[in-house]
């Protein structure tokens, strides 16, 4: 019987099994009973990343600098270009089609995780004993100054946004 199913990396056409084109190549013509599938390599700036029967290769992704994008990994005939964002920016989606400026952590919040090209800054509230008095994409919460270790006393309590104010100890007269 003519085949109704084909082996892996084959496809059924005209009651016969033809080889799929390998990654990096596109289909030119289906196989015949005498010759195998004709495939051609993808051109410059094109790719196909699977065994396929595509008649056109896909265009490599363009990393548009106007959108804050730059090339992280150049595409090949078998892989797409991977874009990432310029310093200080991160991708808005997994596909990284555009970039936004890294978020800064407001006073009272510190950086838990610094942003990368694909993820935004993660902020956390400064817990008791820590503060942040700046808006920053890099600064963590800082511990309050320890007045005791300086032989001083707390004159003004710290908050999540301000450090403690230390002063001299009252001397007995």
């Amino acid at each position: 019987e003519p085949p109704t199913a084909c082996r892996e990396k084959q496809y059924l056409i005209n009651s016969q099994c033809c080889s799929l084109c390998q990654p990096g190549q596109k289909l030119v013509s289906d196989c015949t009973e005498f010759t195998e599938t004709e495939c051609l390599p993808c051109g410059e700036s094109e790719f196909l990343d699977t065994w396929n029967r595509e008649t056109h290769c896909h265009q490599h992704k363009y990393c548009d600098p106007n959108l804050g994008l730059r090339v992280q990994q150049k595409g090949t005939s078998e892989t797409d270009t991977i874009c990432t964002c310029e310093e200080g920016w991160h991708c808005t989606s997994e596909a990284c089609e555009s970039c936004v400026l890294h978020r800064s952590c407001s006073p009272g919040f510190g950086v838990k995780q610094i942003a990368t090209g694909v993820s935004d800054t993660i902020c956390e509230p400064c817990p008791v004993g820590f503060f942040s008095n700046v808006s920053s994409a890099f600064e963590k919460c800082h511990p309050w100054t320890s007045c005791e270790t300086k032989d001083l006393v707390v004159q003004q309590a710290g908050t999540n946004k301000t450090d403690v104010v230390c002063g001299p100890q009252d001397r007995l007269r």
């Epitope: 196989c31 009973e33 005498f34 010759t35 195998e36 495939c39």
Partner: antibody, heavy 119, light 107 residues
């Protein structure tokens, strides 16, 4: 078992005709494309012609185009090669071969039949 | 027409040795290449297809590689029954073509 057997070879004068046959057994003959391949004495293999399962596609080597005709009768499990206007250079051992069912190489060959073109 | 050139024309080796046979195509045939073995007085026998796939019943000392224009048939350890003529054949385009053959003889 799967088998191909050629017949009909012999001595023939230049310019004359000859028809050789190939009988298949042990497989569904009509499910396979078939080929003729020849081998001149002391020489290598030369593909001559091929025919699809239902005879709708036929291909020939340039050296025999217009002189040789391939055909098949699936009901009789038979393949044929009609050779006209024979030349001395057609002298060879003629093999019939089956195209494999799951790839394009020739996986079963007959023992061959000898065609000698000489005056 | 795709021309296949086999080298060397003759290869003289001893049983137990490794044999490397080459087949070069005049244009790319992808991986659509077969290898056949022929012994005197016998019909050719299919060894490899699609460049690197062994045909049914072929021992694993035979292996094939290559794609595009350069192909190799390797016999890892020669057995006495391996001494024969080897042909490559492409099925990428019509006309189908065979290489001129490599004769593997006992040294």
């Amino acid at each position: 078992q799967v088998q191909l057997v050629e017949s009909g070879g012999g001595l023939v004068q230049p310019g004359r005709s000859l028809r050789i046959s190939c009988a298949g057994s042990g497989f569904t003959f009509g499910d396979s494309a078939m080929h003729w391949v020849r081998q001149a004495p002391g020489k290598g293999l030369e593909w001559v012609s091929g025919i699809s399962r239902n005879s709708d596609t036929i291909v020939y080597a340039d050296s025999v185009k217009g002189r040789f005709t391939i055909s098949r009768d699936n009901a009789k499990n038979s393949l044929y090669l009609q050779m006209n206007s024979l030349r001395a250079e057609d002298t060879a051992l003629y093999y019939c071969a089956r195209r494999s069912g799951d790839h394009h190489a020739m996986d079963v060959w007959g023992p061959g039949t000898t065609v000698t073109v000489s005056s | 027409e795709t021309t296949l050139t086999q080298s060397p024309a003759t290869l003289s080796l001893s049983p137990g040795e490794r044999a490397t046979l080459s087949c070069r195509a005049s244009q790319s045939v992808n991986t659509y290449l077969a290898w056949y073995q022929q012994k005197p007085g016998q019909a050719p026998r299919l060894l490899m297809y699609d460049s690197s796939s062994r045909a049914t019943g072929i021992p694993d000392r035979f292996s094939g590689s290559g794609s595009g224009t350069d192909f190799t048939l390797t016999i890892s350890r020669l057995e006495p029954e391996d001494f024969a003529v080897y042909y490559c054949q492409q099925y990428s385009t019509v006309p189908l073509t065979f290489g001129g053959g490599t004769k593997l003889e006992i040294k």
